[in-house]
Interface confidence: low
């Protein structure tokens, strides 16, 4: 999916008002320095591409993020403010429903959500130069 035509300001507002708090809640109990950021993004469409991938695509050691509060809100924000996004996700969501068994918070998931926090922060500061 091409995120170029999303309403970035509306998505940013949704992140600041609610998604960010859900990410903090998920990460509660971990130190902010515990994980190194290994994923980055260069502009807002790129950031949303990475955010969507890390949030909804199961990875080795972490297959359980899609039903978390922050993921549900991320999905809603993308579906509302990215034209045509929801249609592209129908098949992927159905496949995920079949695969998912139970919710387990692993260290790998915590690391993944830490990466997500970094991507969202970058999404909110699109004019900053890359380090």
């Amino acid at each position: 999916y091409d995120f170029t035509n999303c309403d970035f300001e509306k998505i940013k507002a949704a992140y600041l008002s609610t998604i960010s708090k859900d990410l903090i809640t998920y990460m509660s109990g971990t130190k902010s320095t515990e994980f190194n950021n290994t994923v980055s993004c260069s502009n807002r469409p790129h950031c949303l591409t990475e955010i969507q991938s890390l949030t909804f695509n199961p990875t080795a050691g972490c297959a359980s993020l899609a039903k978390e509060m922050f993921a549900m809100k991320t999905k809603a924000a993308l579906a509302i403010w990215c034209p045509g996004y929801s249609e592209t996700q129908i098949n992927a969501t159905q496949a995920m429903k079949k695969r998912r068994k139970r919710k387990v918070t692993t260290n790998k998931c915590l690391e993944q959500v830490s990466q997500l926090q970094g991507l969202w922060r970058r999404f909110n500061r699109p004019l900053l130069k890359q380090q």
């Epitope: 949704a14 008002s17 609610t18 708090k21 859900d22 809640t25 509060m69 549900m72 809100k73 809603a76 924000a77 579906a79 509302i80 034209p83 045509g84 929801s86 249609e87």
Partner: antibody, heavy 118, light 108 residues
Framework: QVQLQESGPGLVKPSQTLSLTCTVS????????VSWVRQPPGKGLEWLGV???????NYHSALISRLTISKDNSKSTVYLQMNSLRAEDTAVYYC????????????WGQGTLVTVSS | EIVLTQSPGTLSLSPGERATLSCSAS???????LHWYQQKPGQSPRLLIY???NLASGVPDRFSGSGSGTDFTLTISRLEPEDFAVYYC?????????FGQGTKLEIK
């Protein structure tokens, strides 16, 4: 079973602050959201805002500067405060429970009529 | 903001007839976020259909919902006297909540 009950002053003067209470039973506010919806006499439904289980809130963009939703989990009570009231805020105010994390309101209170008049 | 427009504003039909109520979104939305409510005078709204086509608990199967993208429909296959009420469509996503202006279904 799930129940919601609104209570409030009934009559409020213009420019004053409205304080409403929604007392819930049959579920816990620690892991469920509660939303406020209003309906002016003879008109349609207007969503005002929501407070989620974790305490995070979302507000109607046109009312965000006038509206505060809070809660006391231990008292199973959700509060709505709206300041700078005007005549057009006259409405029946409902609290409603979203089904999980969604905008699906499966349970509603009976509503409380608030009249803004001097 | 996404705006939901319902049509017609008022629908006059007789018991036994078929009712078709429309809800149009100003931009495309996921079918997961479109819901319908029924409201009778002096009563709270009642959830009728959620996620476009799923009947809420206790709702008779003469009610059905369909649609995708920007156009959604609530159909009552055979009107009963108790079906005459106001119907609202709603965009409810957990981030955004918007109601249509309502369609009044009245007895002809």
């Amino acid at each position: 079973q799930v129940q919601l009950q609104e209570s409030g002053p009934g009559l409020v003067k213009p420019s004053q602050t409205l304080s409403l209470t929604c007392t819930v039973s049959g579920f816990s506010l620690t892991n469920s959201g509660v939303s406020w919806v209003r309906q002016p006499p003879g008109k349609g439904l207007e969503w005002l805002g929501v407070i989620w289980g974790d305490g995070s809130t979302n507000y109607h963009s046109a009312l965000i500067s006038r509206l505060t939703i809070s809660k006391d989990n231990s008292k199973s009570t959700v509060y709505l405060q709206m300041n700078s009231l005007r005549a057009e805020d006259t409405a029946v105010y409902y609290c409603a429970k979203p089904d999980g994390y969604s905008g699906i309101f499966a349970y509603w209170g009976q509503g409380t009529l608030v009249t803004v008049s001097s | 903001e996404i705006v939901l427009t319902q049509s017609p504003g008022t629908l006059s039909l007789s018991p036994g007839e078929r009712a078709t109520l429309s809800c149009s979104a100003s931009s495309s939305i996921s079918s997961n976020y479109l819901h319908w409510y029924q409201q009778k005078p002096g009563q709270s709204p009642r959830l009728l259909i959620y996620r476009t086509s799923n009947l809420a608990s206790g709702v008779p199967d003469r009610f059905s919902g369909s649609g995708s993208g920007t156009d959604f429909t609530l159909t009552i296959s055979r009107l009963e006297p108790e079906d005459f009420a106001v119907y609202y469509c709603q965009l409810g996503s957990g981030i955004l909540f918007t109601f249509g202006q309502g369609t009044k279904l009245e007895i002809k």
